[in-house]
């Protein structure tokens, strides 16, 4: 999906209002410095591409993030403010339903959510502090 035509201001508002709080709750008890940055993004559409990948694509080390509250809200936000996004996700959702539910918060999931926080922080800053 090409995130170029999303309403970035509305997505930013949703992130600050709800998604950020859910991410921080998930990370409670860990410091942001516990994990090094292993993923970055270079503009707002790119950030959303990487956020979608980390949130919804299960990895061998962390298979369960898509069921978390922050993931559900992320999905709803993208569906609301990115034209045509929900249509592209129908097949992905059906595939996700077939997977077994795993509710263990592993250290690797914490690391992945730490990376997500970093991506969202990059997304919400419209510019670097300086040129």
């Amino acid at each position: 999906y090409d995130f170029t035509n999303c309403d970035f201001q509305k997505i930013e508002a949703d992130y600050l209002r709800t998604i950020s709080k859910d991410l921080i709750t998930y990370m409670s008890g860990t410091k942001s410095t516990d994990f090094n940055n292993t993923v970055s993004c270079s503009n707002r559409p790119h950030c959303l591409t990487e956020i979608q990948s980390l949130t919804f694509n299960p990895t061998p080390r962390c298979a369960s993030l898509a069921k978390e509250m922050f993931a559900r809200k992320t999905k709803a936000t993208l569906a609301l403010w990115c034209p045509g996004y929900s249509e592209t996700q129908i097949n992905a959702t059906q595939a996700m339903k077939k997977r077994r539910k795993r509710k263990v918060t592993t250290n690797k999931c914490l690391e992945q959510v730490s990376q997500l926080l970093g991506l969202w922080r990059r997304f919400i800053r419209t510019l670097l502090k300086k040129q």
């Epitope: 940055n37 993923v39 270079s42 790119h46 670097l128 502090k129 300086k130 040129q131």
Partner: antibody
Amino acid sequence: QMQLVESGGGVVQPGRSLRLSCAASGFTFRTYGMHWVRQAPGKGLEWVAVVWYSGSYTHYADSVKGRFTITRDNSKNTLNLQMNSLRAEDTAVYYCSRSPQWEDIFEAMDIWGQGTMVTVSS
Amino acid sequence: SYVLTQPPSVSVAPGQTARITCGGNNIGSKSVHWYQQKPGQAPVLVVYDDSDRPSWIPERFSGSNSGNTATLTISRGEAGDEADYYCQVWDSSSSLVVFGGGTKLTVL
């Protein structure tokens, strides 16, 4: 566990070519800008080139423009530097490094390789 | 093209504060990064975006930037701080990375 490992250095005659590679691991390579920086013996750091995270754009120092080409293969997590028409003044340790970028601005180089030595001598 | 000027050398007594400067035209409008390099080793980022510090760097390292001068400050200097220090900026007008010439810090 985040790592950059350079290879391909060696001794080469003036006017000849050499190709350096940098293997990345432990991070999502495709999301970072990647640089080559060199250091001549006993001298300071000199930036050589950078390639955008996507591979779409490149920028070069004037001293290597037209002779060196930086490329990346995001599917293999590798960065390359093709060096043609080498000169004695290209003798240096060559480092690859990563930096986040925002739009067309490159940020600090937070991970560096250990470097590979290139000697241009007849 | 944009030029960054550093003093070739700076000395500090153990436990004292060292300040390494980096001069450039209106450098305060740019984000300055600082690297430490020990002999035979690759550079290590110690301060980025003027004054931010990577999580692995001790709080003794700090930075500031305004006007035509950026400064790296190393408080409570230790023998292990002996190294070459380089400032660096991204010059948007020419799309080039620029390094300063480097400063050799000696802990007496």
